[in-house]
């Protein structure tokens, strides 16, 4: 069984200072661990590069909205 207690935690210590076009973005994940010093979003680009971004920035929030909408399936 994997040892969840010792599972590695990914943190972001610096954020990109450039706005990334949504056309270059494939997905995102949130860093929610209390072990990390900052709230953060990690975007994965279409070429599989991971980029740390500041969730307080409007372009980051808009990009997350855009990516969320792409997952929408009319199930309900």
């Amino acid at each position: 069984q994997p040892d969840a207690i010792n599972a590695p935690v990914t943190c972001c210590y610096n954020f990109t200072n450039r706005k990334i076009s949504v056309q270059r973005l494939a997905s995102y994940r949130r860093i929610t661990s209390s072990k990390c010093p900052k709230e953060a979003v990690i975007f994965k680009t279409i070429v599989a590069k991971e980029i740390c971004a500041d969730p307080k920035q409007k372009w980051v929030q808009d990009s997350m909205d855009h990516l969320d909408k792409q997952t929408q399936t009319p199930k309900t």
Epitope: S27, R29, E39, P55, D68, K69, T76
Partner: nanobody
Framework: EMQLVESGGGLVQAGGSLRLSCAAS????????MGWFRQAPEKEREFVAL????????FYSNSVKGRFTISRDNAKNTVYLQMNSLKPEDTAVYYC????????????????WGQGTQVTVSS
């Protein structure tokens, strides 16, 4: 951690209205997709409504579409659910949730949950 506290539930007659509120603290509220879910006795938790971060896009389950309205005030860190034309089948505990992970209406993409507020609709 993000804390979510719901309020506004209660007992109402069929055809009546209620407005639920969910106050958030501890994280950057405007960076989360917000949703409402509900769970009736002996039933599974079900999606009710969601609103995106900007507030410009809302999505509803077919069972509440046209009767319920979700909105948010990012300045007040609060999301609302206006419930009109309530029916006995709307009786449930209503939960507010913050969507941290990429997704839409799937409960698994919501990382933070409130304790819930009871809504009872009598006939």
């Amino acid at each position: 951690e993000m804390q979510l506290v719901e309020s506004g539930g209660g007992l109402v007659q069929a055809g009546g209205s209620l407005r639920l509120s969910c106050a958030a603290s501890g994280r950057t509220f405007s960076s989360y997709r917000m949703g409402w879910f509900r769970q009736a006795p002996e039933k599974e938790r079900e999606f009710v409504a969601l609103i995106n971060r900007s507030g410009g896009s809302q999505f509803y389950s077919n069972s509440v579409k046209g009767r319920f309205t979700i909105s948010r005030d990012n300045a007040k860190n609060t999301v609302y659910l206006q419930m009109n034309s309530l029916k006995p089948e709307d009786t449930a505990v209503y939960y507010c949730a913050a969507g941290a992970q990429m997704g839409w209406a799937e409960a698994s993409t919501y990382d933070y949950w409130g304790q819930g507020t009871q809504v009872t609709v009598s006939s």
